[in-house]
């Protein structure tokens, strides 16, 4: 703020002058500015034990500008307020208080919670999750063949993380047992025997066993080993109803 501390130059009557420095309209030796020129705000500035009138282009922190006809003045925000728009509308609270609808509160009202970063009362946000993605292919040790019983997994995404007082997120992963028609693995899919695992390089025509990651499991379409006859489809429907679920992720 640009401050003007006027000093008397021409007497109007005892101790008051209009011939002041800077932004003062009237001033005195003892009190500094008494009133300010248009658009400037009067404020008291403490100098040691004394308060001197000054004229400012904008009010200091903790004050707001009030305008009356030919009188502009810096007026204090409420005691719990750091910056305000007017006496009844705070825009930033002092430490230890939370801002809610222009007021500074010790505690947030019911249905709201304190955001300790912004120091505001905010709506409680509950967790939101997406619909389940399709079940992954039935696998055992990363393979989709050479077994009868395996597991399949499905996932869902967190759309909205909860706030501190919000409802926690439900599981985002589900795994259940599944069965497939027992089918021998084809040459490229065959599980390695003990002696084969010791080899550093695969034989010509063999590929290293690829264990699908979760992304490839989620995005896999039906493969030949997963085609089911009508009897197996009925079994699957029953299994869907009696999901054997193990939770692997909770937020």
């Amino acid at each position: 703020q640009n401050a003007s501390r006027g000093r008397r130059q021409r007497r109007m009557h005892p101790n008051v002058s209009q011939g002041c420095q800077g932004g003062c309209a009237t001033c005195s030796d003892y009190n500094g500015c008494l009133s300010c020129k248009p658009r400037l705000f009067f404020a008291l500035e403490r100098i040691g034990m004394k308060q001197i009138g000054v004229c400012l282009s904008s009010c200091p922190s903790g004050y707001y500008g009030t305008r009356y006809p030919d009188i502009n003045k810096c007026t204090k925000c409420k005691a719990d307020c750091d910056t305000c728009f007017n006496k009844n509308f705070c825009t930033k609270c002092k430490s230890g208080f939370y801002l809610h609808l222009g007021k500074c509160l010790d505690n947030c009202p019911e249905g709201l919670e304190a955001n300790n970063h912004t120091m505001e009362c905010v709506s409680i946000v509950h967790c939101e999750v997406s619909e389940w993605n399709p079940w992954s292919p039935c696998t055992k040790k990363g393979k989709t063949c050479g077994f009868k019983r395996g597991t399949e997994t499905r996932v869902r995404e967190i759309i909205q993380h909860p706030s501190a007082k919000g409802n926690l997120c439900p599981p985002t992963n589900e795994t259940r047992k599944c069965t497939v028609q027992r089918k021998k693995c084809q040459k490229g899919e065959r599980g390695k025997k003990g002696r084969e695992r010791k080899r550093k390089k695969p034989n010509k025509g063999e590929s290293k066993e690829a264990i699908p990651d979760s992304k490839s499991l989620e995005s896999s379409k039906e493969i030949p080993e997963q085609r089911e006859n009508k009897q197996q489809q009925k079994k699957r429907k029953v299994q869907d109803k009696q999901k054997s679920v193990s939770v692997s992720t909770v937020h």
Partner: antibody, heavy 119, light 107 residues
């Protein structure tokens, strides 16, 4: 020395308009803030409003709709009009001045004039 | 509007007594407070402004203090000419409002 003198009728009939004038000497009304204050008999003080050095006015919201403050710079006078008066407006009416927030509020007062509202 | 609550409404004291009058504002008035003395049939006279500044010519036995919402006028040693009614006035914002007054009477 700044002097303020109130003048006007001492008796006003209910529903009529009270009119008072404050004549200032020792200073110009084109500086400072020129106020009206009243005091019902045996009661406290009530601020009515002001007219500024430029002629702008501000009235107490409790009286605003009935109050008009004006000035005549050629005569160095300012005036109060209070319309639709009732017995509750019976009071000693004072004019007073101040020069801004940094100085004494109402450093100079008129002697006061009693206005009685009665039929 | 800011309300000014002055107390006591009256008090009896003797010459030489220390007298204290208080004024409580309904909200922080940031030191914008004046004290006035009024004698019967006379206009009020400003004693103190900006909480603690004595007007030229006012005896030093009058003093003012306070901050925020609570303000005090003290007469350190009451003199015969001090028997009067005292008013506080806030001028932190408009409308300006006075306290109800404190009548200081002879005991």
């Amino acid at each position: 020395e700044v002097q303020l003198v109130e003048s006007g009728p001492g008796l006003v009939k209910p529903s009529e308009t009270l009119s008072l004038t404050c004549t200032v000497s020792g200073d110009s009304i084109t500086s400072g803030y020129w106020n009206w204050i009243r005091q019902p008999p045996g009661k406290g003080l009530e601020w009515i409003g002001y007219i500024s050095y430029s002629g702008k006015t501000y009235q107490n919201p409790s009286l605003k709709s009935r109050v008009t403050i004006s000035r005549d710079t050629s005569k160095n006078q300012f005036s109060l009009k209070l319309s639709s008066v009732t017995a509750a407006d019976t009071a000693v009416y004072y004019c007073a001045t101040y020069y801004g927030y940094g100085g004494p509020h109402f450093a100079y007062w008129g002697q006061g004039t009693l206005v009685t509202v009665s039929s | 509007d800011i309300q000014m609550t002055q107390s006591p409404s009256s008090l009896s004291a003797s010459v030489g007594d220390r007298v204290t009058i208080t004024c409580k504002a309904s909200q922080d008035i940031d030191s914008y407070l004046s004290w006035f003395q009024q004698k019967p049939g006379k206009a009020p006279k400003t004693l103190i402004y900006l909480t603690n500044r004595l007007v030229d010519g006012v005896p030093s036995r009058f003093s003012g203090s306070g901050s925020g919402t609570d303000y005090t006028l003290t007469i350190s040693s009451l003199q015969p000419e001090d028997f009067a009614t005292y008013y506080c006035l806030h001028y932190d914002e408009f409308p300006l409002t006075f306290g109800q007054g404190t009548k200081v009477e002879i005991k």
